[in-house]
């Protein structure tokens, strides 16, 4: 797409005559018609395939034509085309005489043609004007012309479309040949690819705009070269994403369990007593009037939401009191003074009359509840989380955040602390609700049977009749030294009385 521009500069018709040789009366009021068509070796009849344009009356007989482009005028004349410029053309310029202001062919006098010039040749697209002068028997026309591309078209024949842009589809300006030139910070065939912050990790980082470094899942830091440990990892590190390698003195999946959790973290609130219930867990014994895993919740008679129909509950020393909204009364605001005519149902609920219109019931859409559909469904009211798990509302669904040692959708599964064989020296492991317990074999003690102990074989007082007991440290057995008058390994038999055997 482009424009053939023709700048008329001077027309000379000194004698003021027509093509027929007759003079104009009173002078030749001259206007021009221009026909642009495909190249013809000899200009022959046929429609103006590249376009036509005409001028108003520009002067009488001989005159100069002023450049009128700056004022939005019609010189240079514009002949737009919406095809690939072929590089060749034929141009016919006719000068006509118009005695009046009506320039239509049928309004002109029978003899009105002053002159006609035709040129044909090649013309490359460019900013430079070609100056030409054509002389016929009685007239002379001086003019210049050129072909330029329309906005957003480039190349030798104005066939290359390029529109500068700075949006999701590209960030570029156009070079004179129509090729794209990316704006700073952009690259790629269509300059859609941002150049990330220098040093941004090739694999772990990316960007959506220049000089940015956004991290892929599992990575962090200005250049996305630091791994993110497992979500919730408290006292641990990683070498690849989602790892949680515990620091010394910490254990558990999230390295968040302390051997002495109670002392280090004081988790129990409101004066509750804290007990370490095995490694990595604790139990809070609440004072009266408190509840919750950490005794953080104050027990309240309003917790059961006894007030209906949007009533608000106020705790009192001896119970509670419901403040009812307009239209309701009763201990629990259960009685209505409203009917369906009052449009009592909120959030798109539909109203149904009851008791001949004396009462009503609301049918609530999903996600709403309450007598008037005034409450968003709280999926946690049924307290679905087991083992002290915390219930969290997440839009239309819910989730349980489990206490350490528990897992599963509803924290119903106990994480077996014994799975990792924590008891040393052949100790037997027992899963408890809040941890584990090791039963140690003889000669070992400690939480994990890690402490070796000397067995005092005499501790159970195996010798009778006031015999003296000695421990044999090499064999962990005992020896009884009998007083006079007693015999036997444990000094259990009096001398002279043989043991009675059953046979």
């Amino acid at each position: 797409s482009g424009v053939f521009q023709l700048q008329l500069q001077e027309f000379i018709n000194e004698r003021g005559v027509l093509a027929s040789g007759r003079p104009c009366e009173p002078g030749c009021r001259t206007f021009f018609r221009v026909c642009l068509k495909h190249f013809q070796a000899v200009v022959s009849p046929g429609p103006c395939t590249f376009g036509t344009v005409s001028t108003p009356v520009l002067g009488t007989n001989s005159f100069a034509v002023r450049d009128d482009s700056s004022g939005g005028g019609r010189n240079p004349l514009q002949l737009p085309f919406n095809f690939t410029w072929p590089g060749t053309f034929s141009l016919i310029i006719e000068a006509w005489h118009a005695p009046g202001d009506d320039l239509r062919p049928e309004a002109l006098p029978p003899d009105a043609l002053i002159s006609k010039i035709a040129i044909q040749g090649s013309l490359a697209v460019g900013q430079n004007w070609l100056l030409d002068e054509q002389t016929s028997t009685l007239t002379r026309l001086r003019y210049s012309y050129r072909v330029i591309c329309s906005d957003n078209y480039y190349g030798d024949n104005c066939s290359r479309l390029c529109k500068k842009r700075n949006d999701h589809f590209g960030h570029y300006v156009c070079q004179p040949d129509g090729n794209l030139s990316c704006l700073p910070g952009w690259t790629g065939e269509y300059c859609q690819q941002p150049i990330c912050l220098s040093g941004c990790h090739e694999q772990n980082g990316y960007c959506s705009k220049p000089a940015e470094c956004l991290c892929r899942p599992g990575w962090q830091g200005r250049l996305c070269n630091e791994c993110i440990p497992h979500n919730g990892c408290r006292h641990g590190t990683c070498s690849t994403p989602w790892q949680c390698t515990c620091d010394e003195g910490w254990g558990g999946l999230f390295c968040d369990q302390d051997l002495n959790y109670c002392t280090h973290h004081s988790p129990c609130k409101n004066g509750a007593t804290c007990s370490n219930s095995g490694q990595r867990s604790y139990t809070c014994t609440c004072r009266p009037g408190y509840t919750g895993v950490d005794c953080e919740l104050e027990l309240s008679e309003c917790d059961s939401n006894p007030c209906r129909n949007g009533g608000s509950c106020k705790d009192q020393e001896d119970g509670y009191h419901c403040l009812c909204p307009p239209g309701y009364y009763g201990l629990h605001c259960e009685h209505s003074t409203l009917s369906c005519a009052d449009s009592p149902c909120f959030n798109g609920g539909s109203c149904r009359e009851r008791n001949q219109g004396a009462n009503y019931a609301c049918e609530c859409p999903p996600n709403f509840t309450g007598s008037n559909c005034e409450k968003k469904v709280d999926r946690c009211t049924s307290n679905p989380c087991a083992n002290g798990g915390q219930c969290l509302n997440r839009g239309p669904s819910r989730m349980c955040r489990c206490r350490p040692g528990f897992t599963g959708t509803y924290c119903e599964l106990h994480v077996s602390d014994c799975a990792r064989n924590p008891c040393a020296h052949g100790g037997t492991c027992h899963d408890l609700e809040n941890g584990l317990m090791c039963t140690c074999p003889a000669g070992f003690s400690g939480r994990r049977c890690e402490v070796r102990t000397s067995i005092d074989a005499c501790a159970s007082s195996p010798c009778f009749n006031r015999a003296t007991c000695y421990t044999d440290l090499s064999t962990d057995t005992f020896v009884c030294n009998c007083p006079y008058g007693f015999v036997g390994s444990r000094c259990e038999f009096p001398v002279g009385l043989p043991p009675s055997f059953p046979w």
Epitope: A19, P45, P110
Partner: antibody, heavy 120, light 110 residues
């Protein structure tokens, strides 16, 4: 008033040549193209060719190249069509009609037609 | 050479709107074919009506209009009159020559 006045009917023998004229008046003769059209058996039209009287440039229907020759005399505002090597196929009514390139070539004015009969 | 096809005959009544069409054997008719419409009345009286697809010739009544409909050129007479009974020829331009159609005989029942 624009008028195109054609020469009268012609009776020619096969093999002969004939020159039909069309005199223009009421407009600038050299500002418009002159077309020639053949009407056989009183129905269909065939375009023969046209001429630009100012420059003398011509276009011909391939079928009539070598058969028809178009010329003008600017001084008398007259267009001519010569047909040579006549045969009975050339018997028809021939019309001149002007048109103007700038408005897409409307054949606005026509001559009254010249009847050519080729017979031995 | 291209062949230009028209309806051979159409009939209408005074005051009715009638559309005559002109098809090209080479494909769709476009503005580059500069469709022309010519009226022939008895005694070989020819008058040009439309040039360049839709340019009405001087003196031609406004009820005559030219256009492109689909892949054809069209001449529409809006509110036909008895004097519009005639043969209508279309002509299409093909780069360096004109080709006429076979003509449509329009009858206006009076």
């Amino acid at each position: 008033e624009v008028q195109l006045q054609q020469s009268g009917p012609e009776l020619e023998k096969p093999g002969a040549s004939v020159k039909i004229s069309c005199k223009a008046s009421g407009y600038s003769f050299t500002g418009y193209n002159m077309n020639w059209v053949k009407q056989s058996n009183g129905k269909s039209l065939e375009w023969i060719g046209n001429i630009d009287p100012y420059f003398g440039g011509t276009n011909y229907n391939q079928k009539f190249k070598g058969k028809a020759t178009l010329t003008v005399d600017k001084s008398s505002s007259t267009a001519y069509m010569q047909l040579k090597s006549l045969t009975s196929e050339d018997s028809a009514v021939y019309y001149c009609a002007r048109n103007y390139d700038y408005d897409g070539g409307c054949f606005d004015y026509w001559g009254q037609g010249t009847t050519l009969t080729v017979s031995s | 050479q291209a062949v230009v096809t028209q309806e051979s005959a159409l009939t209408t009544s005074p005051g009715e709107t009638v559309t005559l069409t002109c098809r090209s054997s080479t494909g769709a008719v476009t503005t580059s074919n500069y469709a022309n419409w010519v009226q022939e009345k008895p005694d070989h009286l020819f008058t040009g009506l439309i040039g360049g697809t839709n340019n009405r010739a001087p003196g031609v009544p406004a009820r005559f209009s030219g256009s492109l409909i689909g892949d054809k050129a069209a001449l529409t007479i809006t509110g036909a009159q008895t004097e519009d009974e005639a043969i209508y020829f279309c002509a299409l331009w093909y780069s360096n020559h004109w080709v006429f159609g076979g003509g449509t005989k329009l009858t206006v029942l009076g």
